[in-house]
């Protein structure tokens, strides 16, 4: 699987999940988020050669087409597959609020 366990431990040029740390205050200007200060959102990148974690028969065909026709612009894209939530703490006035935000962390990627 093209997940963090594999991708973060290997120098992989093809489609894989890449580490990306986002600091809420520094990177986004969101000063109101109390905890965490930031988190690993991660992202997917890298080419999608034939049969690499193909999501559908369409992406399999597209990957083969691109392999046989390297000059063609059509090829599968490396996109998130599994995402996990992130829990944040912030304050409304002096009242603490905890929110679980869905689909915040990319854990694995696929070619689609």
């Amino acid at each position: 699987a093209l997940d963090t366990n594999y991708c973060f431990r290997n120098l992989e040029e093809n489609c894989c999940v890449r580490p990306l740390y986002i600091d809420f205050r520094q990177d986004l200007g969101w000063k109101w988020v109390h905890e965490p200060k930031g988190y690993y959102a991660n992202f997917c990148s890298g080419p999608c050669p034939y049969l690499r974690s193909a999501d559908t028969t369409h992406s399999t065909v597209l990957g083969l087409y691109n392999t046989l026709n390297p000059e063609a612009s059509a090829s599968p894209c490396c996109v998130p597959q599994d995402l996990e939530p992130l829990t944040i703490l912030y304050y409304v006035g002096r009242t603490p609020k905890v929110e679980q935000l869905s689909n915040m962390v990319v854990k694995s990627c696929k070619c689609s």
Partner: antibody, heavy 121, light 111 residues
Framework: EVQLVQSGAEVKKPGASVKVSCKTS????????MNWVRQAPGAGLDWMGQ????????NYNEMFEGRVTLTADTSTSTAYMELSSLRAGDIAVYYC??????????????WGQGTLVTVSS | DIVMTQTPPSLSVSPRETASISCRAS??????????MHWYLQKPGQSPQLLIY???NLESGVSDRFSGSGSGTDFTLRISRVEANDTGVYYC?????????FGQGTKLELK
Amino acid sequence: EVQLVQSGAEVKKPGASVKVSCKTSGYTFITYWMNWVRQAPGAGLDWMGQIFPAWGMTNYNEMFEGRVTLTADTSTSTAYMELSSLRAGDIAVYYCARGYGNYALDAMDYWGQGTLVTVSS
Amino acid sequence: DIVMTQTPPSLSVSPRETASISCRASESVDSYGNSFMHWYLQKPGQSPQLLIYLASNLESGVSDRFSGSGSGTDFTLRISRVEANDTGVYYCQQNNEDPLTFGQGTKLELK
């Protein structure tokens, strides 16, 4: 230039709902809390609630008894306020107002022009 | 809820004089070294505009004739050398506690 442009005046019957829009431009919509404030004729300002468009998180003023629903469309940078079970006491000008940015509850630095909602049978 | 009480309810001032508006909170609006109190002016037929942020910080583009002071529960907005353009209703607002609340307003007019 930051702009908040609200939808036009509404006339509704008692018991009905009204949905007011607030189209924004000139800043990154998902980065700031959007507040809604109402002002009854000749009266002061009442904070209704707020939404953080990036995540759809909301905080409401309990005085509106769950009659208010705030939503946001990030594709059009537009915020919406829907008020249900309208009554005569809801006749007011409704404002959207951008939060200053340092806190969830905060001062409001840019305001829409206001939308007058009239409730009449 | 924190109740914000403004005095006086209305104020008539001669041009070039100084106007003072008071705002008293029913409990302290201070936290973490800040006073979570702000001031707005609503001119006739217009939306409110932010004047003072966090008790004493002048908002960008606002005349330095406006100044804010105070901490805890007692706050003051001062307008020096009052002009015709300053007429309208002034509101204080706190955000130290949920829900956010406003004062009832002080109407400023020129003599």
